[in-house]
């Protein structure tokens, strides 16, 4: 029950996190015009990964996409890449984790298979979260570096525009959304990995047991237990001689496909 709860919670937390990463990536407010200790302007500038926007006092907002690819700073391209990789990995992780959920039965999928899928999705969520955190942190570092360098006529800005007005940019809402979302995805991934341990059938060390039946002295050697990878067939122990006795693995109860936790 605890394993199912951990897995379910990990899935939900990761789902929220990935939704947040997608939201952050799409948001325009990665950097916003610094209003502190600056003249009050009737124009407010803010920039995202894909476009820059200007909001006037009138409420009129104009956004312009970065239609150039080569003209953009390498750091911005790197941040874009990290966020997209994070989204892709997260999306695949979500897809895998849906099938891995213990509360959902697909055919006669073994718990060992679910355990492996849970681990896979967990690792994907962890990497996804790290990508988002890294992307946001790189952008934040870029802002801090540029903050004091924003002087008149300096060639800066995400769109590579000539600045004739000293416009300094500070952290936008998207950065905080990205950090939180990345953290949630990371936590969700860790929870999935923890749940995986509880799902995996533990490997049993079998010892040879001597059985005596009908006066015959026959030794029984149980076959080695092969743990399922989740993708191959689960090779069960084969009896050497069926003399009414059961090997240890045969008396273990396996959950049927109708057992729901």
């Amino acid at each position: 029950m605890a394993v199912t709860a951990c897995q379910g919670l990990g899935f939900v937390v990761s789902l929220i996190g990935i939704a947040g990463i997608i939201a952050a990536t799409c948001m325009d407010q990665w950097s916003t015009q610094d209003l502190y200790n600056n003249p009050v302007t009737a124009v407010f500038n803010y920039q995202g990964l894909w476009r820059s926007c200007v909001r006037e006092s009138s409420g009129f907002t104009e956004c312009r996409g970065y239609f150039t690819l080569l003209g953009l700073p390498a750091m911005l391209q790197a941040v874009r890449a990290l966020m997209i990789v994070g989204i892709v990995l997260g999306a695949i992780g979500l897809l895998v984790s849906i099938f891995a959920l213990k509360c959902i039965r697909i055919g006669s999928m073994e718990d060992s298979a679910k355990a492996n899928m849970t681990l896979t999705s967990g690792i994907m969520f962890i990497v996804s979260g790290l990508c988002a955190i890294a992307g946001v942190s790189v952008f934040a570092n870029m802002l801090v570096t540029n903050f004091w360098m924003s002087t008149a006529n300096m060639y800066t800005g995400m769109g590579g525009m000539v600045q004739t007005v000293q416009t300094r940019y500070t952290f936008g809402a998207a950065l905080f959304v990205g950090w939180v979302a990345g953290g949630l995805t990371l936590i969700g991934g860790v929870m999935m990995c923890i749940a995986c341990r509880g799902l995996a059938p533990e490997e049993t060390n079998y010892k040879a047991v001597s059985y005596h039946a009908s006066g015959h002295s026959v030794a029984y050697k149980p076959g080695g237990f092969k743990a399922s990878t989740g993708f191959g067939s689960n090779t069960k122990n084969k009896k050497i001689y069926d003399g009414g006795a059961r090997t240890e693995d045969e008396v273990q109860s396996y959950p049927s496909k109708h057992d729901y936790v």
Epitope: Q33, P39, V40, T41, A42, V43, N45, Q47, S52, C53, V54, E56, S57, S58, G59, F60, E62, R64, A152, G157, M161, V162, Q163, T164, V165, T167
Partner: antibody, heavy 118, light 113 residues
Framework: EVQLVESGGGLVQPGGSLRLSCAAS????????MHWVRQAPGKGLEWVSY????????YYADTVNGRFTISRDNAKNSLYLQMNSLRAEDTAVYYC???????????WGQGTLVTVSS | DIVMTQSPDSLAVSLGERATINCKSS????????????LTWYQQKPGQPPKLLIY???TRESGVPDRFSGSGSGTDFTLTISSLQAEDVAVYYC?????????FGGGTKVEIK
């Protein structure tokens, strides 16, 4: 047709108070920022105050800050300017103007004359 | 505060001739975000409220004759009336629409010579 009509002007003694009103019609008043601009007799234009569409931002000229208060009632399609501690130099025709993209004033009222004199 | 300096104070031009009014701001009115200059030109005739002519330094307001044009960037701007008509006799004001307070220039009176 967009119309802005100012009222409330008149003769007032120095130190006195006056409340100007601007009635708006012909457009969705609640969607536009509004300004007050004044013009002393025979002089140029002087910006006085601004209020955003949802009252979230309010700005004043240094010359009136602390004495004048801008407000609006979107339900009544009205803009107001409460003027306290009036001085002789506040004598002017007061215009209300609608803010539009480019932060320009596309429509102006006909103005109301405020005379501060003893 | 941003100081807007207009020149000349008054201008007498013959009908059909070109009239040029200059406006200089103490700080750049160019916004880096959209590369637009936040400067507006108004025309005021006697006894009337001002009328919007040009915004974003060079964009003509709808209904304004094409003989009116605006140019310039940063701190230096110009309003040009390519062929002065009798109805153009008025006072012209430039306005800073970038920094609060939104200051106006002193005005330029255009008359017919």
């Amino acid at each position: 047709e967009v119309q802005l009509v100012e009222s409330g002007g008149g003769l007032v003694q120095p130190g006195g108070s006056l409340r100007l009103s601007c009635a708006a019609s012909g457009f969705t008043f609640s969607s536009f920022g509004m300004h007050w601009v004044r013009q002393a007799p025979g002089k140029g234009l002087e910006w006085v105050s601004y209020i955003s569409s949802g009252n979230s931002a309010i700005y004043y000229a240094d010359t009136v800050n602390g004495r004048f208060t801008i407000s609006r009632d979107n339900a009544k399609n009205s803009l107001y300017l409460q003027m306290n501690s009036l001085r002789a130099e506040d004598t002017a025709v007061y215009y209300c103007a609608r803010l539009r993209y480019g932060n320009s004033f596309d429509y102006w009222g006909q103005g109301t004359l405020v005379t501060v004199s003893s | 505060d941003i100081v807007m300096t207009q020149s000349p104070d008054s201008l007498a031009v013959s009908l059909g001739e070109r009239a040029t009014i200059n406006c200089k701001s103490s700080q750049s009115l160019l916004n880096s975000g959209n590369q637009k200059n936040y400067l507006t030109w108004y025309q005021q005739k006697p006894g009337q409220p001002p009328k919007l002519l040009i915004y974003w330094a060079s964009t003509r307001e709808s209904g304004v004759p094409d003989r009116f044009s605006g140019s310039g960037s940063g701190t230096d701007f110009t309003l040009t009336i390519s062929s002065l008509q009798a109805e153009d006799v008025a006072v012209y004001y430039c306005q800073n629409n970038y920094y609060y307070p939104l200051t106006f220039g002193g005005g330029t009176k255009v008359e017919i010579k």
